[in-house]
């Protein structure tokens, strides 16, 4: 039987010669556990592992801690790859995080973080970010220093309220903070003055719910 090549991220797949965007099987670091992920092999040189996508409101993002841990949705459509996989892979070496955003007027913007990783579940998948560049704001819309991840059944935010229940979706809420890319999906003409929408404050300001978002990671040395 031919030995199957194991990829821990889309950068490894790309470097092995697989340069077509699509869904690939990735293996957790130091384990045989597998997950399906969408690989963007075109944007900025390719090799990007997509960890989140919003585009049409077809998937419910008001999910439990376990669902955000393991991932949900379809890699080729709206999905969350899974905090456990992302935590494990981003602790192996330095990764960059690119967040691509689209509004309802046809504008696009991005935020690129030079170093991104998630703490383990023991530390509530706390987000760590350094070195912001890009066109989606001069200040990070994910609060720095990073916060713990919260879901509707795991309130780890810094608010006396429950941000995940109030704003919907799992996110690294502060109190509650200037972003939530896992908020409620609002269609065009219903996307303004929404406190619980898909928010990236330092690009579109308060109340604007975005049309589409993609979060993707790649090794810094790619």
């Amino acid at each position: 039987k031919e030995e199957q090549i194991i990829f821990r991220d889309c950068a490894e797949a790309f470097k092995s010669g697989l340069t077509t965007s699509g869904t690939y099987t990735l293996t957790f670091p130091n384990s045989t556990e597998e997950t399906k992920a969408y690989c963007d092999m075109e944007t900025g040189g390719g090799g990007w592992t997509v960890i989140q996508r919003r585009e049409d409101g077809s998937v419910d993002f008001q999910r439990t801690w376990k669902e955000y841990k393991m991932g949900f949705g379809s890699p080729s459509g709206e999905h969350w790859l899974g905090n456990e996989f992302v935590s494990q892979v981003t602790n192996q070496k330095r990764y960059v995080l690119k967040i691509h955003l689209r509004d309802w007027e046809g504008n696009e913007a991005y935020s690129l973080y030079e170093h991104f990783y998630l703490s383990s579940e023991e530390f509530n998948y706390r987000i760590h970010l350094k070195g912001l560049t890009g066109t989606a704001g001069k200040i990070s819309s994910i609060s720095q220093p990073g916060n713990d991840f919260s879901t509707k059944d795991a309130d780890n935010d810094k608010c006396i309220c429950k941000c995940s229940q109030m704003l919907t979706g799992g996110w690294w809420f502060d109190a509650c903070g200037p972003s939530n890319l896992n908020g409620m999906y609002y269609p065009q003409r219903q996307n303004t003055n929404k406190f619980n929408g898909i928010k990236w404050y330092y690009w579109k300001g308060s109340g604007y719910s975005l049309k589409a978002t993609t979060m993707m990671i790649r090794p810094a040395d790619f």
Epitope: E114, H115, H128, L129, K130, G131, L132, K138, I139, Q144, P145, G146
Partner: antibody, heavy 115, light 107 residues
Framework: SEHLVESGGGLVKPGGSLRLSCATA???????MSWVRQAPGKGLEWVGS????????YLNTKFIGRFTISRDDSKNTLYLQMNSLRAEDTAVYYC?????????WGQGTLVTVSS | AIYMHQEPSSLSASVGDRVTITCHGS??????VAWYQQKPGKAPKLLIF???FKVYEVPSRFSGSGSHEDYTLTISSLQPEDFATYYC?????????FGHGTKVEIK
């Protein structure tokens, strides 16, 4: 902010030297950092800035030849070396994250130049 | 260096008043202007950048406006915690420069 903590201020005689330090949280590693000072009862004055790897430094022209900015990312520390100090250098010195504007500030350290 | 002429240098106002502070740069600034609030013994706090973009945590009563050389900070309804000194800053050109400040005092 506990994420930027200045130290090294104090009383120094005119003509003396002082090195200020700013202990930075590690998430500032890839950011430009600046020193800003404020004389007692006066306004704010930008001293200079330094890029993430320390390869680009911008100093307010009035401090060229006397002040030097550096950083040691292995220690998460920003420095301001001040030589040939004058009475008019008496001020609170702040370190700040520099995005052009300053969105994170330390609590400041007081430098008094007096004989 | 770009000179930032800030007016007034001080003002007395009451809680609930609308307060306006202006800054005039000696050259075109392309909206690269920030506003800060400073209380005695404390570091400045960023309120507004890019002329009119409010920092997320800052209350909605604070707003910035302006273009070219002229910029304004407005507090729509002054609150007790707003009594402080306010500074404008330009970051279009090195060296970055600040206005001389406006002290907002209780009438």
């Amino acid at each position: 902010s506990e994420h930027l903590v200045e130290s090294g201020g104090g009383l120094v005689k005119p003509g003396g030297s002082l090195r200020l330090s700013c202990a930075t949280a590690d998430f500032f590693e890839y950011d430009d950092m600046s020193w800003v000072r404020q004389a007692p009862g006066k306004g704010l004055e930008w001293v200079g800035s330094i890029s993430p790897k320390g390869d680009h430094k911008y100093l307010n022209t009035k401090f060229i030849g006397r002040f030097t900015i550096s950083r040691d990312d292995s220690k998460n520390t920003l420095y301001l070396q001040m030589n040939s100090l004058r009475a008019e250098d008496t001020a609170v010195y702040y370190c700040a994250r520099d995005v052009g504007f300053f969105d994170w500030w330390g609590q400041g350290t007081l430098v008094t130049v007096s004989s | 260096a770009i000179y930032m002429h800030q007016e007034p240098s001080s003002l007395s106002a009451s809680v609930g008043d609308r307060v306006t502070i202006t800054c005039h740069g000696s050259y075109w600034l392309n909206s690269e202007v920030a506003w800060y609030q400073q209380k005695p013994g404390k570091a400045p706090k960023l309120l507004i950048f890019d002329g009119d973009f409010k920092v997320y945590e800052v209350p909605s009563r604070f707003s910035g406006s302006g273009s070219h050389e002229d910029y304004t900070l407005t507090i729509s309804s002054l609150q007790p915690e707003d009594f402080a000194t306010y500074y404008c800053q330009q970051y279009r050109y090195h060296p970055y420069t600040f206005g001389h400040g406006t002290k907002v005092e209780i009438k």
